[in-house]
C-alpha cells in the first residue's frame, strides 16, 4: 500500500498519480489521467460542497421546514449550507436546528435571568428576596419591592418572591 | 522534506548542446509531473516544458520545439532536459518544478546556470 | 497564448504599507492562477495558488483575489522580508505563461 502522505493535503492517489481534488462548490466528473487534470463541475441550484472533495453528487442544502418553526436565517452558496434558525418566540431544540419548540415561561416567583433567542432556551432564576414575579412571563425580570419609605408609607403587607409589598399609610397619634 | 537538484549547466557556444539533469528526493516522483522553468538573468520567469508522471504527455513552448527534449527515469527519481542548438537567447538559470494540480509550481530546485556564448 | 499583464512593474512601499499587486489575462483563466515570491538569487516560492488559496506556511497577510481575468495578489501589512519580486503565472492552458513580474522595493 501506499504512504498516506505520497500526495498533498488537495490531492487523492489514483492509478499512481496524484490528482487535484475539487474545490469547494464542485463535484468531481473524472479523475485525473496522464493526458487531463482531474474534471470537476460546480455544484448545482440549492447544493453545496463545502471542502475540497471527489464526491460525485453534492449535498442538497437544508430545508428549513415552515411547519416545524424554522425559517431560513443565511442563504445557502455552492459553498455552504443553508442555515436554519426559529420563528420569534421559538428556539432549536439541537446545534443542527432541525427543529423548533416554543420559549419556556418563567413561573411566579421566578424572573428571566437571559432572554430565549433562535437556538437557546430561556434562562429563569429564582426572585431574590427584595424582588418579586407575580406573572408566568418569557421577559419579565424579577422586580423590586416597592419601596414604601420614600413614598412615606409603611409596609402592610411583607412582599414575597410572588407579590409585591403593601403599602399602607403611618398610622397618626391622636392629640 | 521534497528536494530537487539541479546540476549539468554551463558555457556553451551556440548551436551545441547540453543536458539537464534533476535528482528528486523526499516524495513519490513518479506520481507527479514536472516542468522546467527559466529565467534569464535580470529577467522574469519562462515556462520550458512539462512531463506527464509516466512520460506520455509532453508540452513545449513554441521556441524551444524540436530543440530541446524533456524525459524522465522514474526509477532513477530523475527529470532532464536535453538541449541541442543552443541560442544566446537560451541563456538562463534553468529551474526543475514539480508541475502538480492544484498547486502546480509548488517545489523547486536551486537552478542550474546556462549561458550560451 | 494566453498573455498576462502584471502590474505595477515596480513599486515602493514602507514597512507597514498595505501593497496590491494585479494580474490582468488576455482571457478567462477560471482562477487557474499561482502567485510566487522571488528573492534575489533565491529559487521562487508559492504563496497562492488557484487564485485565493495560501500556501502551506505562507504568512497570513498574503492573499490573492479574483476570478475571470482580473486577479490581485494582497499584502495587508508589508514586513521587511517582503521586499521582493512577485509574479504570477497562469495554469489555464499550454503554454503557461507569467506575468512581467512586480518588484517591491523599500520607500
Known amino acids: 500500500p501506499e504512504p498516506p502522505t505520497a500526495c498533498r493535503e488537495k490531492q487523492y492517489l489514483i492509478n499512481s498519480q496524484c490528482c487535484s481534488l475539487c474545490q469547494p462548490g464542485q463535484k468531481l466528473v473524472s479523475d485525473c489521467t496522464e493526458f487531463t487534470e482531474t474534471e470537476c463541475l460546480p455544484c448545482g441550484e440549492s447544493e453545496f460542497l463545502d471542502t475540497w472533495n471527489r464526491e460525485t453528487h453534492c449535498h442538497q442544502h437544508k430545508y428549513c421546514d415552515p411547519n416545524l418553526g424554522l425559517r431560513v436565517q443565511q442563504k445557502g452558496t455552492s459553498e455552504t449550507d443553508t442555515i436554519c434558525t426559529c420563528e420569534e418566540g421559538w428556539h432549536c431544540t439541537s446545534e443542527a436546528c432541525e427543529s423548533c419548540v416554543l420559549h419556556r415561561s418563567c413561573s411566579p416567583g421566578f424572573g428571566v435571568k437571559q432572554i430565549a433567542t433562535g437556538v437557546s432556551d430561556t434562562i429563569c432564576e429564582p426572585c431574590p428576596v427584595g424582588f418579586f414575579s407575580n406573572v408566568s412571563s418569557a421577559f419579565e425580570k424579577c422586580h423590586p419591592w416597592t419601596s414604601c419609605e420614600t413614598k412615606d408609607l409603611v409596609v402592610q403587607q411583607a412582599g414575597t418572591n410572588k407579590t409585591d409589598v403593601v403599602c399602607g399609610p403611618q398610622d397618626r397619634l391622636r392629640a | 522534506e521534497v528536494q530537487l537538484v539541479e546540476s549539468g549547466g554551463g558555457l556553451v557556444q551556440p548551436g551545441g548542446s547540453l543536458r539537464l539533469s534533476c535528482a528528486a528526493s523526499g516524495f513519490t516522483f513518479s506520481y507527479f509531473p514536472m516542468a522546467w522553468v527559466r529565467q534569464a538573468p535580470g529577467k522574469g520567469l519562462e515556462w520550458v516544458a512539462t512531463i506527464s508522471t509516466s512520460g506520455g504527455n509532453i508540452y513545449y513552448r513554441d521556441s524551444v520545439k524540436g530543440r530541446f527534449t524533456i524525459s524522465r527515469d522514474n526509477a532513477k527519481n530523475s527529470l532532464y532536459l536535453q538541449m541541442n542548438s543552443l541560442r544566446a537567447e537560451d541563456t538562463a538559470v534553468y529551474y526543475c518544478?514539480?508541475?502538480?494540480?492544484?498547486?502546480?509550481?509548488?517545489?523547486w530546485g536551486q537552478g542550474t546556470m546556462v549561458t550560451v556564448s | 497564448d494566453i498573455q498576462m499583464t502584471q502590474s505595477p512593474s515596480s513599486l515602493s512601499a514602507s514597512v507597514g504599507d498595505r501593497v496590491t499587486i494585479t494580474c490582468r489575462a488576455s482571457?478567462?483563466?477560471?482562477?487557474?492562477l499561482n502567485w510566487y515570491q522571488q528573492k534575489p538569487g533565491k529559487a521562487p516560492k508559492l504563496l497562492i495558488y488557484r487564485a485565493t488559496n495560501l500556501e502551506d506556511g505562507v504568512p497570513s497577510r498574503f492573499s490573492g483575489s479574483g476570478s475571470g481575468t482580473d486577479y490581485t495578489l494582497t499584502i495587508s501589512s508589508l514586513q521587511p522580508e517582503d521586499f521582493a519580486t512577485y509574479y504570477c503565472v497562469q495554469h489555464k492552458q499550454y503554454p503557461l505563461t507569467f506575468g512581467g513580474g512586480t518588484k517591491v522595493e523599500i520607500k
Open positions: 482571457q478567462d483563466i477560471g482562477n487557474y
Open positions: 518544478t514539480r508541475d502538480t494540480a492544484p498547486y502546480y509550481f509548488d517545489y
